[in-house]
């Protein structure tokens, strides 16, 4: 997934207490037992800092070595720093683990910018604020890297939660979540609530902030409001989905829906931005500019480079439009839409202006590898990765940042014909097509 532009975090959670849940529709109750309910021990188990990803605490080896690991639904390797590096406070020391097993195999992962390489092995892994299990999992011990680790990010490795097809060096290397499900009775499902800051955080706040929740094995009611809407996973490699329509403030971009998914659309927690194919990005920016034309912003702002600053507390959210993505539904000719606010796609940046100003980057950017629904999208929603039923669920997050006038939304159903035609069929080429990193 690696990295590029990552995201802000929120201090505390805005979710209602368990006794004050909104009434919800019951069409989800058909799910098998144990997959829904309360996962108190896992709530608030993610942290992170602005633009640098969300991480969970994990332990590896015997005796356990504690590391912070970036949660990445856009890759499939469990890889951890295993040698000294200027940006790492700690790293996995294989020689200190009595349960480490060397697979005598190397792995090399290049990105568009940067790379990591390492040695494959297996060891015992657990998640302290996760299910009470220990599993033997594949680990890539990173021995060399370039532009991979981020100075001050506080994470030392990456947990790739996608499917084996995109694992390196090949699909025979079982990803962590597959190992977890195989070796335990944990249901084949996890869910993510990423909580963006909505305001710039200083260093102290950022380090102390709660970033969200990764619920392993099910769905936690307290993390969302309203109902969950599901879109099929088109193919089990990345978490690939199909977008059938895009609107800016309710205005349809009116593009051939294939363009929205050219060459794929994925849900990726390891990418900060909402990334759109070139043609779609250009149309979206044109529409966002038109909607916000009472003010004009510099060219570099729309490129995600320049920061626009307003007097603290006076950011004119109302002049920026909402962005709606319509996703293929589970029923034929039915779709639903997810709508994000400028509070999601304008990313607060700290340390650039005076304390009297709030500064933001535009967090929608151009992609040459398809649509990437990164943290900008995910911070609005509770996202359920229902691998067992090959679908991804979206509901309004209990911690999303909004104002008194607008809120993020998940709404449906909408009648949409010929949705299958919206998917792009990638010509089969060699493995090198997977070598582009994500910004």
């Amino acid at each position: 997934t690696h990295l590029g532009i990552r995201l802000p975090l929120r201090s505390g959670l805005a979710g209602p207490p368990l006794g004050l849940r909104l009434p919800r529709e019951t069409d989800e109750e058909s799910e098998e037992p144990g997959r829904r309910g309360s996962f108190v021990e896992m709530v608030d188990n993610l942290r992170g800092k602005s633009g640098q990803g969300y991480y969970v605490e994990m332990t590896v080896g015997s005796p356990p070595q504690t590391l912070n690991i970036l949660v990445d639904t856009g890759s499939s390797n469990f890889a951890v720093g295993a040698a000294p590096h200027p940006f790492l406070h700690r790293y996995y020391q294989r020689q200190l683990s009595s349960t480490y097993r060397d697979l005598r195999k190397g792995v090399y992962v290049p990105y568009t910018q940067g790379k990591w390489e390492g040695e494959l092995g297996t060891d015992l892994v657990s998640i302290p604020h996760g299910p009470n299990v220990t599993v033997r999992a594949n680990i890539a011990a990173i021995t060399e890297s370039d532009k991979f680790f981020i100075n001050g990010s506080n994470w030392e490795g990456i947990l790739g939660l996608a499917y084996a097809e995109i694992a390196r060096p090949d699909d025979s290397l079982e990803p962590f979540f597959d190992s977890l499900v195989k070796q335990t009775h944990i249901p084949n499902i996890f869910s993510l609530q990423l909580c963006g800051a909505g305001f710039p955080l200083n260093q102290t706040e950022a380090l102390a902030s709660v970033g969200g929740s990764m619920i392993i094995g099910g769905i936690d009611h307290s993390l969302y409001t309203g109902r969950l809407w599901y879109t099929p996973i088109r193919r089990e490699w990345y978490y690939e989905v199909i977008i059938v329509r895009v609107e800016i403030n309710g205005q349809d971009l009116k593009m051939d829906c294939k363009e929205y998914n050219y060459d794929k659309s994925i849900v990726d927690s390891g990418t900060t931005n909402l990334r759109l194919p070139k043609k779609v990005f250009e149309a979206a920016v044109k529409s966002i500019k038109a909607a916000s034309s009472t003010e004009k912003f510099p060219d570099g702002f729309w490129l995600g480079e320049q920061l626009v600053c307003w007097q603290a507390g006076t950011t004119p959210w109302n002049i920026f439009p909402v962005i709606s993505l319509y996703l293929m539904g589970e029923v034929t000719n039915q779709s639903f839409r997810i709508t994000i606010l400028p509070q999601q796609y304008l990313r607060p940046v700290e340390d650039v202006a005076t304390s009297q100003d709030d500064c933001y980057k535009f967090a929608v950017s151009q992609s040459s590898t398809g649509t990437v629904m990164g943290a900008v999208i995910m911070e609005g929603f509770y996202v359920v990765f229902d691998r067992a039923r090959k679908r991804i669920g979206f509901a309004v997050s209990a911690c999303h940042v909004h104002d008194e006038f607008r809120t993020a939304a998940v709404e449906g159903p909408f009648v949409t014909a010929d949705m299958e035609d919206c998917g792009y069929n990638i010509p089969q080429t060699d493995e090198s097509t997977l070598m582009t990193g994500r910004a």
């Epitope: 003010e295 004009k296 510099p298 060219d299 570099g300 320049q306 600053c309």
Partner: antibody
Amino acid sequence: QLQLQESGPGLVKPSETLSLTCTVSGGSTSSSSYYWGWIRQPPGKGLEWIGSIYRSGSTYYNPSLRSRVTISVDTSKNQFSLKLSSVTAADTAVYYCARVGHGISYFDLWGRGTLVTVSS
Amino acid sequence: EIVLTQSPATLSLSPGERATLSCRASQSVSSYLAWYQQKPGQAPRLLIYDASNRATGIPARFSGSGSGTDFTLTISSLEPEDFAVYYCQQSLTWPPRTFGGGTKVEIK
């Protein structure tokens, strides 16, 4: 070609309000391509940005002056104006109006400037 | 807040010599940096924008370079009219607001 010209009193008493107008000729303050700004320079010192305005009236101010500054635009007269209240001797400076161009990121055209002295 | 530090404060050179002026940002401003020239009793004039692009009508002897935190304005061969004060300004944070303290280029 486009020109900017500042006008207003050269002497203002302490605690009063400094008022300046910038008249744009050879161009239009209603252009969607530009912001319009005020910058000042105390005698023998560096440049200090005061604030900027768009044709819609949308304004941005220097945080250190924000509580005292008002910038407005009158597109029908092709003018924009600066008001700085509760002035002190520290506000004595040459005041420049300028156009913000080149991707609205830089001050690409300036007026000649007008010296405003704050003194009783 | 991004702070721009210019050095040296004063540069004493003779006509025909090469002038190298430095502007350092307290954190990266990418390439969003401009240089202005101000002669005594005149308004500043934009010389260079986006770190290296010459503004309209600026002679080729003026060139800008750098990105991130370190920037340089070079005058390849000083003409008599080039003796002035030079300011840098960043616009990574918008609206453009921050100027450096200036470098005075004087005749030796």
